[in-house]
């Protein structure tokens, strides 16, 4: 986990609301586990940032993420420049000035620093459909999720409807 | 503009079957997650059970769980509730109602059909 | 399953009166609640969402706030198209559950 104190002493005032040019509509700090109950972990290794899946020993302490939610206009293909609803976007930051990032390319799910305001490789659309678990959809990459393999997180292809409901790109969100 | 329409409601004995339908448009109905909400005769609102914008997660209220059937035909923009066994309890006017997020229940319901009554009675 | 409890359950008040609504749920539902109206033999109507988003259309006299456990639904001065039954509703975990409801009455 970090050895930082960042990542237990969030705050808003961290991450001031230019991101992207919205505020998030609500930030959630959360530790974030599969859907089998093992964490999600940030280690800090050769100066650059692990992001693992493991068992935790009993009485270790999770690793938190601020969540900070967006939501963006969805426009209505039937009725021209109308808007249907709304798209709810995240971003997920374990420490100050770092975010998950989507590396399309290598499948792989990856620690930025990042300058803002984001890039869209650092938002996922948010379902919540399945077994009070969520599942993060790349934004620039629709289909793609992020999920579980080989304990470690990357990025899988989603391809039929049924498929959602897979446990590796299913997890639970507490504020444990 | 957004419209839902429901129908398939009405009087059936304790132990009967109904098909609900609601028939959507003026938005991209396949985007969107879906869901039932009724109404008991003086009472507060109950949530029945959710399905995703593809049909491919479902939820549904204790309740009704195992009685009640959520669907959905994205061709035809009609969203279904399969109802059996059902009992007095689930008189109520029931309601189908549009997401405001298109993958996720979090942001609550902004369209609501007029509902249709279902009489469960002897 | 959470259950959202509503106070109070009617109030009485008079246009351009200031009415709070309270709703408190059994356990923490982050910033996931959704606030709508009622009127007789109508179907409920959006007002906020994520605990203090305006939806869309709806007056700014209407406003939420909260997180966690307890929200509150302020109308900052009553009109008389205000008049109705309203619901809370969390919206963070399945079964989605609402508050029994806030009949605000003509004084």
């Known amino acids: 986990a970090f050895g930082i104190s960042g990542v237990q002493k969030y705050t808003r005032a961290l991450h001031d609301s230019s991101i992207t040019g919205i505020s998030p509509i609500t930030e959630y700090l959360a530790s974030l586990s599969t859907y089998n109950d093992q964490s999600i972990t940030f280690a800090l290794e050769d100066e650059s940032y692990e992001i693992y899946v493991e068992d935790l020993k009993k009485d270790e302490k999770k690793d938190k993420v601020l969540l900070s939610y967006y939501e963006s206009q969805h426009p209505s293909n039937e009725s021209g420049d109308g808007v249907d609803g709304k798209m709810l976007m995240v971003t997920l930051s374990p420490t100050k000035d770092f975010w998950l990032h989507a590396n399309n390319k290598e499948h792989s799910v990856e620690l930025h620093k990042c300058e803002k305001p984001l890039p869209d490789q650092a938002f996922f659309v948010l379902h919540n459909m399945h077994s009070n678990c969520v599942s993060f959809e790349c934004k620039t990459d629709p289909g793609v999720f992020i999920g579980v393999k080989d304990n470690h997180l990357a990025l899988i292809k989603v391809d039929s409807s049924e498929n959602l409901c897979t446990e590796n790109i299913l997890f639970k969100l507490s504020e444990t | 503009e957004v419209q839902l329409v429901e129908s398939g409601g009405g009087l059936v004995q304790p132990g009967g079957s109904l098909r609900l339908s609601c028939a959507a448009s003026g938005f991209t109905f396949s985007s969107y997650v879906m869901s039932w909400v009724r109404q008991a005769p003086g009472k507060g609102l109950e949530w029945v059970s959710s399905?995703?914008?593809?049909?491919?997660?479902?939820n549904y209220a204790d309740s009704v769980k195992g009685r009640f059937t959520i669907s959905r035909d994205n061709s035809k923009n009609t969203l279904f509730l399969e109802m059996n066994s059902l009992r007095a309890e689930d008189t109520a006017v029931y309601y189908c109602?549009?997401?405001?997020?298109?993958?996720?229940?979090?942001?609550?319901?902004?369209?609501w059909g007029q509902g249709t009554l279902v009489t469960v009675s002897s | 399953d959470i259950q959202m409890t509503q106070s109070p359950s009617s109030v009485s008040a008079s246009v351009g009166d200031r009415v709070t609504i309270t709703c408190r749920a059994s356990q923490g539902i982050s910033s996931w609640l959704a606030w709508y109206q009622q009127k007789p033999g109508k179907a409920p109507k959006l007002l906020i969402y994520?605990?203090?988003s305006l939806q869309s259309g709806v007056p700014s006299r209407f406003s939420g706030s909260g997180s966690g456990t307890y929200f509150t639904l302020t109308i900052s001065s009553l009109q008389p198209e205000d008049f109705a039954t309203y619901y809370c509703q969390q919206a963070n975990s399945f079964p989605l559950t609402f508050g029994g409801g806030t009949k605000v009455e003509i004084k």
């Open positions: 399905i995703s914008g593809n049909g491919g997660s479902t």
């Open positions: 994520a605990a203090s």
């Open positions: 109602a549009k997401s405001l997020g298109t993958t996720t229940t979090f942001l609550g319901f902004d369209y």
